[in-house]
Interface confidence: low
C-alpha cells in the first residue's frame, strides 16, 4: 500500500508522458490523478515504465474502479494487463474483439497463462458463443486452445486456423475432438506433397478413418509406433497386415511390445494368424489357419 | 494457483469398485477441466477421465470406458472417479489434475494408490 502523501509543487501531472518515469512511486501516486490515467492509458504502453511503475498505476485504477475496469481503459492497459489478476479480470466485461486480441498480443509468444485463460472465459461469456471469428483469434494466438474446446464448437474452427497447429497442441485432445479436426487438417494440407504432407497431419491421425490409413500405407510414410498406437481401433481394424507393414515401414517391429495393448491387441485378434507368421515378430493370437472368417457386419447388411 | 488433494485409494479385489475424489482448492474459478490420470509402475502417465468444467462433458479412453465414471461436485470444488469392474491392470498411482483452457494440464495432486490384486 503506497503511503497518502501532497504532491510536490509543480509536479502534478498534466499528461500521461516520458517525464512520469523520473518519478519516485509515491510521487506517481501523489501527482498523477487517476481519471487521467484512464482517459491516457493509450500512451502507458509507450513510456518504459518499471514494474514498480506499473504496480502504482494499476492501484490508482483499482481505485477509481473498484467494481472493474471499463472496456475502453481495458483496451489500452498494454503491459499492465500482466500486473492483472484473474480475480481482477473477472471483474470485466470485455464485448470487443479489438480489445481481446489486444490483450492477447500482450501476451503473445508465452504459455497461456491464467489472466489470459479468464479473459477468454469472460469474453466467450459476455458474448454468448464462439463465434468463428473469436475462434480465429484465440487458435491464432494460442493453436493449444483447440483441446479445451467441446466437439460441437470445433466445428466452427476454421481450416486456416490448423496451419498454426503444432503436435505438441494437440496432446490434450481426445478422439472426438481429433474426428472433428482430422478432416479440416486434412483439407487444409490437401495441397502439399507426400511426405510434408504426413509431417503434417501426423499428429491428427487419432481421427482418421480406415480409407485415409490405407492410403497412406501406399506412400511410404514409416509411421512411428507412438502414432500408431493413438489411431482409432476402429479405423485399425481393417487393414490388412500388408497394409500395417507398408504403414509403418521398419517401425513394424515396434508391433511386438505393443501386442497386449489397443489397437495392436484388437488387430491382431482380426488378422489370420499365418499372415501375422510373415511379420517374422512371433505375434499371437490371430486367426488359426484353416478357420472360416465370417464378416457379420456384411451379413447384416444383406439381412 | 490451485491445489488438489485425492483420497480414496487402496486395496481392492478384481471385479471390485473403488471411489476416487479430489479435493480442490485456490483459484479454481477459472479452471476449463478437471481429469484423472494414472501411472503404474515402469509406465508414462495414462489419461483415465476428464470433465469439462463448462458444460459437464466427459471422455474416457477405451481401457475404461463403461467401467469408470466422473464427476463433480461444484459446490464442494469436489471431483470424483467411480471405478467398477476393476481389474489388475489398473492398478496404478491414481492422479487428480486441472488445467485453464490451455493444451496441457498444469495443476497436479500427489496421486492416491489403488492395488487391485487377490
Known amino acids: 500500500e503506497v503511503e497518502k502523501t501532497a504532491c510536490p509543487s509543480g509536479k502534478k501531472a498534466r499528461e500521461i508522458d516520458e517525464s512520469l518515469i523520473f518519478y519516485k512511486k509515491w510521487e506517481l501516486e501523489a501527482c498523477v490523478d487517476a481519471a487521467l490515467l484512464a482517459t491516457q492509458m493509450d500512451r502507458v504502453n509507450a513510456i518504459p515504465f518499471t514494474y514498480e511503475q506499473l504496480d502504482v498505476l494499476k492501484h490508482k485504477l483499482d481505485e477509481l474502479y473498484p467494481q472493474g475496469y471499463p472496456e475502453s481503459v481495458i483496451q489500452h492497459l498494454g503491459y499492465l494487463f500482466l500486473k492483472m489478476s484473474p480475480e481482477d479480470i473477472r471483474k470485466w466485461n470485455v464485448t470487443s474483439l479489438e480489445t481481446l486480441k489486444a490483450l492477447l498480443e500482450v501476451n503473445k509468444g508465452h504459455e497461456m497463462s491464467p489472466q489470459v485463460a479468464t479473459l477468454i472465459d469472460r469474453f466467450v461469456k459476455g458474448r454468448g458463443q464462439l463465434d468463428k471469428d473469436t475462434l480465429d483469434t484465440l487458435t491464432a494466438f494460442y493453436p493449444g486452445y483447440l483441446c479445451s474446446l467441446s466437439p460441437e464448437e470445433l466445428s466452427s474452427v476454421p481450416p486456416s486456423s490448423i496451419w498454426a497447429v503444432r503436435p505438441q497442441d494437440l496432446d490434450t485432445c481426445d478422439p472426438r475432438q481429433l474426428d472433428v479436426l482430422y478432416p479440416k487438417a486434412r483439407l487444409a494440407f490437401q495441397n502439399m506433397n507426400g511426405s510434408e504432407y504426413f509431417v503434417k497431419i501426423q499428429s491428427f491421425l487419432g481421427g482418421a478413418p480406415t480409407e485415409d490409413l490405407k492410403a497412406l500405407s501406399q506412400q511410404n510414410v514409416s509411421m512411428d509406433l507412438a502414432t500408431f498406437m493413438k489411431l482409432r481401433t476402429d479405423a485399425v481394424l481393417p487393414l490388412t497386415v500388408a497394409e500395417v507393414q507398408k504403414l509403418l515401414g521398419p517401425h513394424v517391429e515396434g508391433l511386438k511390445a505393443e501386442e497386449r495393448h489397443r489397437p495392436v491387441r484388437d488387430w491382431i485378434l482380426r488378422q489370420r494368424q499365418d499372415d501375422l507368421d510373415t511379420l517374422g515378430l512371433g505375434l499371437q493370437g490371430g486367426i488359426p489357419n484353416g478357420y472360416l472368417v465370417l464378416d457379420l457386419s456384411m451379413q447384416e447388411a444383406l439381412s | 494457483e490451485v491445489q488438489l488433494v485425492e483420497s480414496g485409494g487402496g486395496l481392492v479385489q478384481p471385479g471390485g469398485s473403488l471411489r476416487l475424489s479430489c479435493a480442490a482448492s485456490?483459484?479454481?474459478?477459472?479452471?476449463?477441466?478437471m481429469g484423472w490420470f494414472r501411472q503404474a509402475p515402469g509406465k508414462g502417465r495414462e489419461l483415465v477421465a476428464t470433465?469439462?468444467?463448462?458444460?459437464?462433458?466427459?471422455y474416457y479412453p477405451d481401457s475404461v470406458e463403461g467401467r469408470f465414471t466422473i464427476s463433480r461436485d461444484n459446490a464442494k470444488r469436489m471431483v470424483y472417479l467411480q471405478m467398477n469392474s476393476l481389474r489388475a491392470e489398473d492398478t496404478a498411482v491414481y492422479y487428480c489434475?486441472?488445467?485453464?483452457?490451455?493444451?496441457?494440464?498444469?495443476?497436479w495432486g500427489q496421486g492416491t494408490q489403488v492395488t487391485v490384486s487377490s
Open positions: 470433465i469439462n468444467t463448462v458444460d459437464d462433458i466427459t
Open positions: 489434475a486441472a488445467r485453464y483452457m490451455t493444451q496441457s494440464f498444469s495443476y
Open positions: 485456490g483459484s479454481i474459478s477459472s479452471i476449463y477441466a
